[in-house]
Amino acid sequence: DAHKSEVAHRFKDLGEENFKALVLIAFAQYLQQCPFEDHVKLVNEVTEFAKTCVADESAENCDKSLHTLFGDKLCTVATLRETYGEMADCCAKQEPERNECFLQHKDDNPNLPRLVRPEVDVMCTAFHDNEETFLKKYLYEIARRHPYFYAPELLFFAKRYKAAFTECCQAADKAACLLPKLDELRDEGKASSAKQRLKCASLQKFGERAFKAWAVARLSQRFPKAEFAEVSKLVTDLTKVHTECCHGDLLECADDRADLAKYICENQDSISSKLKECCEKPLLEKSHCIAEVENDEMPADLPSLAADFVESKDVCKNYAEAKDVFLGMFLYEYARRHPDYSVVLLLRLAKTYETTLEKCCAAADPHECYAKVFDEFKPLVEEPQNLIKQNCELFEQLGEYKFQNALLVRYTKKVPQVSTPTLVEVSRNLGKVGSKCCKHPEAKRMPCAEDYLSVVLNQLCVLHEKTPVSDRVTKCCTESLVNRRPCFSALEVDETYVPKEFNAETFTFHADICTLSEKERQIKKQTALVELVKHKPKATKEQLKAVMDDFAAFVEKCCKADDKETCFAEEGKKLVAASQAALGL
């Protein structure tokens, strides 16, 4: 499938609009600080060049790889060294090292201003004045803030973004129409970014085998009627797609994703009965729909797993002949029978099974040795079940905000060295598991909760990796991908932590808090709570709750005062003094 010109091949496959959008995303994900106009200029230059290659694939430089073409283009940016520092050294390298170097400099937490949403009329005017620029700017702003965002999925978000403005800017009440849609896109976008970040971390930190194992488990749950060979083919193709996107090969990734969607729809009879509606949609919607499709019904009368994987005399022979294929079959068979288990639990069970076979197949009596292997699964299954039960009870008792606060305290005591903004962000997201998953019946709770927690804890891991401060975080993040959540759950209070010096400035608040949204006000309070725990890690939850109650009353009182700023200054001093006295700070 070799093409004389890779750039011409991708331009023809994807079409000009998608080609330009994907190149813009790629460039913005690499050079996250560059102004929009500079990126648009680079994209236009690449597009013009691609057109010359479409016209004549033998034209000069058309035979170069996409990495060479794109890397050369990125390295023409004049301010590379001033803006990016050592990333400029990447340009001295040859491919493929140069691309690897760019990838290593992607920043999960770039120092960029928060995106502030303009007034609806201002946005609608900008949309009507120059629709193309408006939509490009959306792609640019999302891509630079989320350097691992799944590029073909971002095209789908942009399509929905455009549809929202097209519809709502003509509506009688523009704001009532548009704002809920933008909120939904923002929330879905953050979730999509975090899910993809875990896929990339899985591939980059734990390798292709780890990702494939994840994919076998998930696809087997989703397509339990599909044969193992069919699932294996889908896993291979899906792994290629995500390897490409995570590696910055966005044109190839989008092209291969489209091919995979086409294949799935052409073969839906042997994959799943739930794909019909998805397959009637246009390409971007189709791919998104397939990725989110509900699990198909399990085939009736599936035989017991024990026959092939415990009772058979050929277990060790089959394992020895093709270890990964045999383990893949085990994972497939277990997962298709257990849509009620999280993917990470299924992977833990497969790992336990693998470890047992490694030990037992070298023993004098292998069958006797592995006969009770399924008994070892029981505690592994019960641990997340119990944890979810306890935490859903707590969530139902407290509600989301106070449940987040309980997690803030819990995680700050476990890893107090982690920065306060990271602890707040991660704990708030951990706390959202309650609203997201606790409403589900028992059979759907674990896959919802534990697989969501894997995504959130990966956020902690990637943010911590940028500035490592805690050996415990590093240990939980790097030792085992599937055991990250149990590792964090098992952490107790860090007894080695030396409490932070008390700084009254940290607890000084001003009248600006009164104009914040409820969410922003919560974040302010939660930031104070984390700081409080860092100062007094031995404080009981009752003591902390009392201080937080005082803080809430203080903010409410001063926001109602005639002279707000004076109230915040005077009452704030009293609050700090009372908290210090009560906690012995």
């Epitope: 201080v547 908290s579 009560a582």
Partner: nanobody, 123 residues
């Protein structure tokens, strides 16, 4: 200056219920966190329950959680402690307390205290 007067104590059987009241004087009752403490003979005074000025947040000692309920009526300047499923170990003098700060109240360092009311639970 806030004055606190407790009432409602008495002698009851194990398993019975009792409701304590604490009447407060003063016009700014709703700006005070209110709480109940208890002291059995020969022991230190112990936190039982507290409620914020608005009544939107409460907290309890583990030993009474699920059995006792604290509430307040700001129109009547009164705080209540509903005690259900009483046990002999709940026998103590019960004190009402008030402070501008929940944290100081919780820590037993309240600015204002009542004289106490005796609760005796016989087995």
């Amino acid at each position: 200056e806030v004055q606190l007067v407790e009432s409602g104590g008495g002698l009851v059987q194990a398993g019975d219920s009792l409701r304590l009241s604490c009447a407060a004087s003063g016009r700014t009752f709703s700006s005070y966190a209110m709480g109940w403490f208890r002291q059995a003979p020969g022991t230190e005074r112990q936190f039982v329950a507290r409620i914020t000025g608005k009544g939107d947040s409460t907290d309890y000692a583990d030993s009474v959680r699920g059995r006792f309920t604290i509430s307040r009526d700001n129109a009547k300047n009164t705080v209540y402690l509903q005690m259900n499923s009483l046990k002999p170990e709940d026998t103590a003098v019960y004190y009402c307390a008030a402070d501008a700060f929940n944290s100081l109240l919780q820590a037993g360092r309240a600015e204002y205290w009542g004289q106490g009311t005796q609760v005796t639970v016989s087995s």
